[in-house]
């Protein structure tokens, strides 16, 4: 294998917590050049499993604002606008990385955390359990 | 917003790039205590806008493997199993944070990056443009 050079361009690793505690550049590189897609699509309204977006705000977390989808109905919306309860609206969930301030209120000390967020809703056929 | 106290228990923030460069504890905390919910649903198969999951792999990124949803059909699946092309299957996208080594091979220096991923699909009513 290749030995990783501890080259002079690297930050110092004398910290007693190394390698658990590292330097992270928050000058975020964004690979998506388009406008934020969550604002540019209206799928949440046009979906047969429509959802509302709720603002989840936490000043101790980065990003501090995360939008959580909550399905509007238990069932799915039919072409006539009525809800079909033989189908289910369910949230699509995604595990994401966030940074949480630790210790709390420290401006430049964070901990990596995985959280689960609901991104939107989809319409599914229910699982029917048959009783013998 | 709240004024964040510069308390003495916090790491020093003299760095001229502050708060762009921060200390992060990478001993990941997982807020999902139940059986891993991100992986336990089969909505991708049961949805009226089903999707396949494609592997997006990058060994220089954490997480190294991210799953991208690709809608199986242009239309949506009806109760009889046929596809209704008067409706559209569309991907629900989410911007997520990933970590990338920077400079490469520096063991304790990372950069946060935003990438756009398709998490799943939903069935929407198409936008019909009427020609005058």
């Amino acid at each position: 294998g290749i030995a990783i050079p501890r080259n002079s361009g690297c930050p110092n690793s004398e910290d007693k917590n190394f390698p658990r505690t590292v330097m992270v550049n928050l000058n975020i590189h964004n690979r998506n050049t388009s406008t934020n897609p969550k604002r540019s699509s209206d799928y949440y309204n046009r979906s047969t499993s429509p959802w509302n977006l709720h603002r989840n705000e936490d000043p101790e977390r980065y990003p501090s604002v995360i939008w959580e989808a909550k399905c509007r109905h238990l069932g799915c919306v039919k072409a006539d606008g009525n809800v079909d309860y033989h189908m289910n609206s369910v949230p699509i969930q995604q595990e994401i990385l966030v940074l949480r301030r630790e210790p709390r209120h420290c401006p430049n000390s964070f901990r990596l955390e995985k959280i689960l967020v609901s991104v939107g809703c989809t319409c599914v056929t229910p699982i029917v359990h048959h009783v013998a | 917003g709240i004024a964040i106290p510069r308390n003495s228990g916090c790491p020093n923030s003299e760095d001229k790039n502050f708060p762009r460069t921060v200390m992060v504890n990478l001993n990941i905390h997982n807020r999902n205590t139940s059986t891993n919910p991100k992986r336990s649903s089969d909505y991708y198969n049961r949805s009226t806008s089903p999707w396949n999951l494609h592997r997006n792999e990058d060994p220089e990124r954490y997480p190294s493997v991210i799953w991208e949803a690709k809608c199986r059909h242009l239309g949506c699946v009806k109760a009889d199993g046929n596809v209704d092309y008067h409706m559209n299957s569309v991907p629900i996208q989410q911007e997520i944070l990933v970590l990338r080594r920077e400079p490469r091979h520096c063991p304790n220096s990372f950069r946060l990056e935003k990438i756009l991923v398709s998490v799943g699909c939903t069935c929407v009513t198409p936008i019909v443009h009427h020609v005058a």
């Epitope: 294998g1 | 891993n36 060994p59 190294s64």
Partner: antibody, heavy 117, light 106 residues
Framework: QVQLVQSGAEVKKPGSSVKVSCKAS????????ISWVRQAPGQGLEWMGS????????NYAQKFQGRVTITADESTSTAYMELSSLRSEDTAVYYC??????????WGQGTLVTVSS | DIQMTQSPSSLSASVGDRVTITCRAS??????LNWYQQKPGKAPKLLIY???SLQSGVPSRFSGSGSGTDFTLTISSLQPEDFAVYYC????????FGQGTKVEIK
């Protein structure tokens, strides 16, 4: 092409410890985890725990908690698995594997650890 | 822990046969199911990941299907080099393996 090369066979006394190494050649550890999986003679596969060398983050199977320690040295691209308080039931082939956190796609050749008085 | 149960535990087949191995999870695991092949004295080799995706370099005679709790590995036309032990493994939670299915020459 990633290759994981493990240390040689070991014979240990009950109550002692063993430390097995796993060196990644043909590239660095990258951002993958390294998992350790063992296989007792004629038996199936059993996951013991993993480490993400980038971070030093470890995750252990409940069964081995407190008895196994997984570490990694990025400068040599080597991961280690130390198992303490050995007993005869720990006689097995120990494998390291590259772990995407979804599947194990590259495996070491295995290290036979024999625990015998 | 999620329990994985494979069946059969062993089977005898001839070259050219179609072989099917099943794996059942004790709870729903979506599609986070992998299949491995292991030959005597060798490390396991990844064949199928995410229930149905063929790992690169693996012959197309191997295929996987299933979702939720029930999964299948199929070898469409058994070749001499396919005689081995096959394991399923879930990664919905901490990884666990099935007990293995030994495919022997009839």
């Amino acid at each position: 092409q990633v290759q994981l090369v493990q240390s040689g066979a070991e014979v240990k006394k009950p109550g002692s410890s063993v430390k097995v190494s796993c060196k990644a050649s043909g590239g660095t550890f990258s951002s993958y985890a390294i998992s350790w999986v063992r296989q007792a003679p004629g038996q199936g596969l059993e996951w013991m725990g993993s480490i993400i060398p980038w971070f030093g983050y470890t995750n252990y199977a409940q069964k081995f908690q407190g008895r196994v320690t997984i570490t990694a040295d990025e400068s040599t691209s080597t991961a280690y698995m130390e198992l303490s308080s050995l007993r005869s039931e720990d006689t097995a082939v120990y494998y390291c594997a590259r772990d995407s956190e979804y599947y194990f796609d590259h495996w070491g050749q295995g290290t036979l650890v024999t625990v015998s008085s | 822990d999620i329990q994985m149960t494979q069946s059969p535990s062993s089977l005898s087949a001839s070259v050219g046969d179609r072989v099917t191995i099943t794996c059942r999870a004790s709870q729903g695991i979506s599609n986070w199911l992998n299949w491995y092949q292991q030959k005597p004295g060798k490390a396991p080799k990844l064949l199928i990941y995410a229930a149905s995706s063929l790992q690169s370099g693996v012959p197309s005679r191997f295929s996987g299907s299933g979702s939720g709790t029930d999964f299948t590995l199929t070898i469409s036309s058994l070749q001499p080099e396919d005689f081995a032990v096959y394991y399923c493994q879930q990664y919905s939670d901490d990884p666990t393996f099935g007990q293995g299915t030994k495919v022997e020459i009839k």
